[in-house]
């Protein structure tokens, strides 16, 4: 058993039929010695008396808020949560496996630049009685500070009969060094509590591996005289690291016909303009990627040819 | 050329060669995003690799103030990786494919290090750790880790030379 926060404790249980469970001793936080009784949750049934209560925790029915009282007055509370271990593996019931980029991916994180700011998100089908707490650091043995905000519900989607809820959190490395080559990964730890179930999820990454620039901005077309060609121009996104002579991007320009089956023409360039042939009803799209490190491409910025 | 007295390197040549190094490092190990090599107990194998750290002066301001600190650090790293790529980690079993970019990568590391420090001038170089994995699968894993680490190193080097070419060239 360990303390998650004040008056909240996590009991780690091997979860299998007829498992013996864990013996837990609760102590009433009071100077009183006599006349103390214990109850669980809303029930008025007295579970025991005395300053300590010994219980055998085997299942969710044994978890919950234990309260010690004296003469009708509440003295203190202890909330017991369960962390299930089945076949040697901690349960992952609360979050959905996003399966990208690989199985057992519960947390996904992205950064728009090298400033040390990043966003992580996760999915669940659970709508109520759910809390998240996020901690992060650079490295684990001698951790350097990363500050995370509160996790918030960022999207709701309907998936068949069920809804899916997306939560996200923003974190910022306290002493980020955008130009350095990272040697220690960022660690992100999410504590999830649904009713009386506790689970924890972790992710470890280098900022360079989760970079995904915003799409190029101010995408414009300039027709060239007496030609089907156009000059496409764009700018670096505002959120990208500066100076651009140091933090450079490379770009992919695509001409796409109306039908998805039509052949796509693609041009790669380090410049912020390109000359392409604009077909009728086609659209021109541009996306960006770090020039020197192959992390994710940005989403496309698009304009119609006409 | 970057001479240990402080003259400027051939920024544009260094820029071109370092960008080529980035391309080669990724073509040598393209599936890097799909393998989480940090799960494989990376500390003991790649902790000794020279990293370009915060105090090494490789940020835009540091380059403007005195690019020599940074260039020396890059040079150390280039020599380190050049030696690793020439070691039995890469020459031993399992053999690299004949068209593997590792050979080109090795040559380009050497080429860039020579651009930074011509014959007859010596900066301190870092000791290469003795990494001689006994099993072929260990060697394969170590190659992946070294290439992954190299990708990060050459990305920073390429940024340095791109910025130098744009802002510090005579």
């Amino acid at each position: 058993i360990w303390e998650l926060k004040k008056d909240v404790y996590v009991v780690e249980l091997d979860w299998y039929p007829d498992a013996p469970g864990e013996m837990v001793v609760l102590t009433c936080d009071t100077p009183e010695e006599d006349g103390i009784t214990w109850t669980l949750d809303q029930s008025s049934e007295v579970l025991g008396s005395g300053k300590t209560l010994t219980i055998q925790v085997k299942e969710f029915g044994d978890a919950g808020q234990y309260t010690c009282h004296k003469g009708g007055e509440v003295l203190s509370h202890s909330l017991l949560l369960l962390h299930k271990k089945e076949d040697g593996i901690w349960s992952t019931d609360i979050l959905k496996d996003q399966k990208e980029p690989k199985n057992k991916t519960f947390l996904r994180c992205e950064a728009k630049n090298y400033s040390g700011r990043f966003t992580c998100w996760w999915l669940t089908t659970i709508s109520t009685d759910l809390t998240f707490s996020v901690k992060s650091s650079r490295g684990s043995s001698d951790p350097q500070g990363v500050t995370c905000g509160a996790a918030t519900l960022s999207a709701e989607r309907v998936r068949g009969d069920n809804k899916e809820y997306e939560y996200s959190v923003e974190c910022q490395e306290d002493s980020a060094c955008p130009a350095a080559e990272e040697s220690l990964p960022i660690e992100v730890m999410v504590d999830a509590v649904h009713k009386l179930k506790y689970e924890n999820y972790t992710s470890s990454f280098f900022i360079r591996d989760i970079i995904k620039p915003d799409p190029p901005k101010n995408l414009q077309l300039k027709p060239l005289k007496n030609s089907r060609q156009v000059e496409v121009s764009w700018e670096y996104p505002d959120t990208w690291s500066t100076p651009h002579s140091y933090f450079s991007l490379t770009f992919c320009v695509q001409v796409q016909g109306k039908s998805k089956r039509e052949k796509k023409d693609r041009v790669f360039t380090d410049k912020t303009s390109a000359t392409v042939i604009c077909r009728k009803n086609a659209s021109i799209s541009v996306r960006a990627q770090d020039r020197y490190y192959s992390s994710s491409w940005s989403e496309w910025a698009s304009v119609p040819c006409s | 050329r970057a001479v240990p007295g402080g003259s400027s390197p051939a920024w544009t040549q260094c820029q071109q060669l370092s960008q080529k190094l980035c391309t080669l490092a990724w073509s040598a190990h393209p599936l890097v995003g799909h393998m989480d090599l940090r799960e494989e107990g990376d500390e003991e194998t790649t902790n000794d690799v020279p990293h370009i750290q915060c105090g090494d002066g490789c940020d835009p301001q540091g380059l403007r103030d005195n690019s020599q600190f940074c260039l020396q650090r890059i040079h150390q790293g280039l020599i380190f990786y050049e030696k690793l790529l020439g070691s039995d980690i890469f020459t031993g079993e399992p053999s690299l494919l004949p068209d593997s970019p590792v050979g080109q990568l090795h040559a380009s590391l050497l080429g860039l290090s020579q651009l930074l420090q011509p014959e007859g001038h010596h900066w301190e170089t870092q000791q290469i750790p003795s990494l001689s994995p006994s099993q072929p699968w260990q060697r394969l894993l170590l190659r992946f880790k070294i290439l992954r680490s190299l990708q990060a190193f050459v990305a920073v080097a390429a940024r340095v030379f791109a910025h130098g070419a744009a802002t510090l060239s005579p």
């Epitope: 809303q42 969710f60 089908t125 709508s127 109520t128 009685d129 809820y165 649904h194 | -």
Partner: antibody, heavy 117, light 108 residues
Framework: QSVEESGGRLVTPGTPLTLTCTVS????????MIWVRQAPGEGLEWIGI?????SAYYASWVNGRFTISKTSTTVDLKMTSPTTGDTATYFC??????????????WGPGTLVTVSS | FELTQTPSSVEAAVGGTVTIKCQAS??????LAWYQQKPGQPPKLLIY???KLATGVPSRFSGSGSGTQFTLTISDLECADAATYYC???????????FGGGTKVVVV
């Protein structure tokens, strides 16, 4: 502590109807409330709940046909466009106060809604 | 999400024992309640958290199970136990909520 439903009557299909659940002896700001219906001779079917904080959650079949809201002492169930299939006794019940998705220990007697042309 | 109750009806003698099963289509941990309903009356809470007896409910009623399989057992049957019994999941309003189809208990 009690709850009581009212507003059930005979309506024609498509005529909006609001049922009201009036509570006494406890505060709605501390408990989840549920609306459940039971067609003649059938089982219990949950429609939706409204949390202590005022968030409403609905069964997947509801699709906007019902809306739950509350004041300090009442919980309303609005039937936007009733059909004959909505003929049932409608129950309101109070949760235990432990969770938003809760079990229910205080029930009203129910109010009968008949939808017929 | 579905809760399947079996059997749909059962007949037993006074003093006998009745077992009603409730199966969830996904794990709901121990978040299951049992209710008793008599004709013309609202449901009455018997058991919550799969096995905890509600206030004032005789100990002849007991609940067990967790995950997806749950059981309500009524022992020493009395005539007053003739009613329809419902299980209810309260795991989550989106990912596991609702009532079973009911089991009618006839006491002979």
């Amino acid at each position: 502590q009690s709850v009581e439903e009212s507003g059930g009557r005979l309506v024609t299909p498509g005529t909006p109807l609001t049922l009201t659940c009036t509570v006494s002896g406890f505060s709605l700001s501390s408990y989840t409330m549920i609306w459940v219906r039971q067609a003649p001779g059938e089982g219990l079917e949950w429609i939706g709940i409204i949390s202590a904080g005022g968030s409403a959650y609905y069964a997947s079949w509801v699709n906007g046909r019902f809306t739950i809201s509350k004041t300090s002492t009442t919980v309303d169930l609005k039937m936007t466009s009733p059909t004959t299939g909505d003929t049932a006794t409608y129950f309101c019940a109070r949760g235990s106060g432990t969770y938003t998705s809760d079990y229910f220990n205080i029930w009203g007697p129910g109010t009968l809604v008949t939808v017929s042309s | 999400f579905e809760l399947t109750q079996t059997p749909s009806s059962v007949e037993a003698a006074v003093g006998g024992t009745v077992t009603i099963k409730c199966q969830a289509s996904q794990s709901i941990d121990s978040w299951l309640a049992w209710y008793q309903q008599k004709p013309g009356q609202p449901p009455k809470l018997l058991i919550y958290s799969a096995s905890k007896l509600a206030t004032g409910v005789p100990s002849r009623f007991s609940g067990s199970g967790s995950g997806t399989q749950f059981t309500l057992t009524i022992s020493d049957l009395e005539c007053a136990d003739a009613a329809t019994y419902y299980c209810q999941s309260y795991y989550d309003a989106n990912a596991g909520y609702g009532f079973g189809g009911g089991t009618k208990v006839v006491v002979v």
